[in-house]
């Protein structure tokens, strides 16, 4: 009697549906009364499967409504173990454990990534500095080295900094900045850049005419805006008030004059 | 050194319920198999199930209507329950360990007589 | 189930005498993984619980003195004292682990003479 496995690693992605496999010797019906199938992970109970019942009280929680032996499998000789929505968690090595008539079992080893695919932009710029700041943020796991390019994929130098957090589902979030001197329409790449092939993702930041956001030291430059503004508006309203005031002084004074007098009088004043 | 010790009632009434215990020293439950055997006044051995390290069971099929195998890590124990109860289930009862799924029992209790009588 | 059978049910010896008692299986117990036989010896003494002598069919357990030799196959298994001493006097019984439920022989006595 020998189990056997199609493959002995699979690589999964996180969020997504994998089902495993084990091979075993069934000779025309299966008969369920002598077959037990254990699945494990580690030290945590998947599957029981014992005489045609599978004995949920003795999973362990982190399987719980997520994992399942697909019994249509059973009597072709495969005892395949679906687990769905895939964690962080699911990563390891797990036992299938076979018992008809004699007895085997077999180890496959689970790894499981998660693509920094969805890459968070941002661009501010200080105007103090003219210097730009361009932000890449995205999720995923393992590990990523942020990589950051200009329009000839050349790399770009600049002030960078890189912090790293845990989100709830252990996924690793990942924040990359880079402040460089740019002009509009400059184009540049971050890389989400990981060793194994196809799991580097790249955004394309494009440096806009006017800056897409305003750092918190702009709010400085728009109270300062404001108060010249206001001044102006105190300004004339003061000086038309004078205005008015000075026209009637000039009617108390002289009285009714000529009209040639009473325009270039008008006229000065308006051009006052 | 792993060392096993049964306790428990050594006199049964018919149609009651046999409850064992097994307190294990020198290991924990992280690893292994932890078993059940017998052995019958005509010197029959029988296995009766386990408990795994990860909380698997497996009862033989002969019992398997009457058997339950629980443990409590905490206490280090491991317990036999055996329902409905016979004079066919006096025995000396053992507690064993094997050392994975399809190995032998290396360590084995001191063992427990049960007679089961009214 | 796989039936164990063992050979004879009492054996008389003398001390310093070589003895040998049989097992056998109702199916193979050749595990494909390893290429070795899922069968072991054990020995109860009166009063005592059984204790591992034998696995794989002819690896000793540690502490087993040399004397004791498992040996066979498939399906027919021998367990051989080259010198029997006084102490050996105890019940043998062998046992698959091959597939589930594990199954014992009836035992072998061994008894003086």
């Known amino acids: 009697f020998t189990v056997t496995v199609p493959k002995d690693l699979y690589v999964v992605e996180y969020g997504s549906n994998m089902t495993i496999e084990c091979k075993f010797p069934v000779e025309k019906q299966l008969d369920l009364a002598a077959l037990i199938v254990y699945w494990e992970m580690e030290d945590k109970n998947i599957i029981q499967f014992v005489h045609g019942e599978e004995d949920l009280k003795v999973q362990h929680s982190s399987y719980r409504q997520r994992a399942r032996l697909l019994k249509d499998q059973l009597s072709l000789g495969n005892a395949a173990l679906q687990i769905t929505d895939v964690k962080l968690q699911d990563a390891g090595v797990y036992r299938c454990m076979i018992s008809y008539g004699g007895a085997d079992y077999k180890r496959i080893t689970v790894k499981v990534n998660a693509p920094y695919r969805k890459i968070n932009q941002r661009i501010s710029v200080d105007p103090a500095t003219s210097e730009h700041e361009l932000i890449c943020q995205a999720e995923g796991y393992p590990e990523a080295e942020v990589i950051w390019t200009n329009s000839d994929h050349q790399p770009v130098s600049g002030k960078r900094s890189v912090t790293t957090s845990r989100t709830e589902g252990m996924l690793l979030n990942v924040t990359s900045s880079l402040r460089v001197n740019a002009t509009a329409n400059d184009v540049f790449y971050c890389t989400f850049w990981r060793s194994q092939p196809g799991q580097n993702h790249t955004a394309e930041l494009i440096i806009p005419e006017l800056p897409a956001t305003h750092p918190p030291q702009n709010r400085t430059h728009w109270v300062l805006l404001g108060s010249i503004l206001l001044f102006l508006i105190v300004v004339s309203t003061v000086l038309l008030f004078l205005r008015k005031q000075v026209r009637m002084l000039d009617v108390e004074k002289c009285g009714v004059e000529d009209t040639s007098s009473k325009n270039r009088n008008d006229t000065q004043f308006e051009e006052t | 050194e792993v060392q096993l010790r049964e306790s428990g009632p050594s006199l049964v009434r018919p149609s009651q319920t046999l409850s064992l215990t097994c307190s294990v020293t020198g290991d924990s439950f992280t690893s292994g198999y932890w078993n059940w055997i017998r052995k019958f006044p005509g010197n029959e051995l029988e296995s009766m199930g386990y408990i795994s390290y990860s909380g698997s069971t497996y009862y033989n099929p002969s019992l398997k209507s009457r058997i339950s195998i629980t443990r409590d890590t905490s206490k280090s124990q491991f317990y036999l329950q055996l329902s409905s109860v016979t004079a066919e289930d006096t025995a000396t009862y053992y507690c064993?360990?094997?050392?994975?799924?399809?190995?032998?029992?290396?360590?084995w209790g001191q063992g427990t007589l049960v007679t089961v009588s009214a | 189930d796989i039936v164990m059978s063992q050979s004879p049910s009492s054996l008389p010896v003398s001390v310093g005498e070589k003895v040998t008692m049989s097992c056998k299986s109702s199916q193979s117990l050749l595990y494909s993984s390893n290429q070795k036989n899922s069968l072991a010896w054990y020995q109860q003494k009166p009063g005592q619980s059984p204790k591992l002598l034998i696995y794989?069919?002819?690896t000793r357990e540690s502490g087993v003195p040399d004397r004791f030799t498992g040996s066979g196959s498939g399906t027919d298994f021998t367990l051989t004292i080259s010198s029997v001493q006084a102490e050996d006097l105890s019940v043998y019984y062998c046992?698959?682990?091959?597939?589930?439920?594990?199954?014992f022989g009836s035992g072998t006595k061994l008894e003086i003479k």
């Open positions: 064993a360990r094997s050392e994975g799924w399809l190995l032998p029992f290396a360590y």
């Open positions: 046992q698959q682990y091959y597939g589930y439920p594990f199954t």
């Open positions: 794989w069919a002819s």
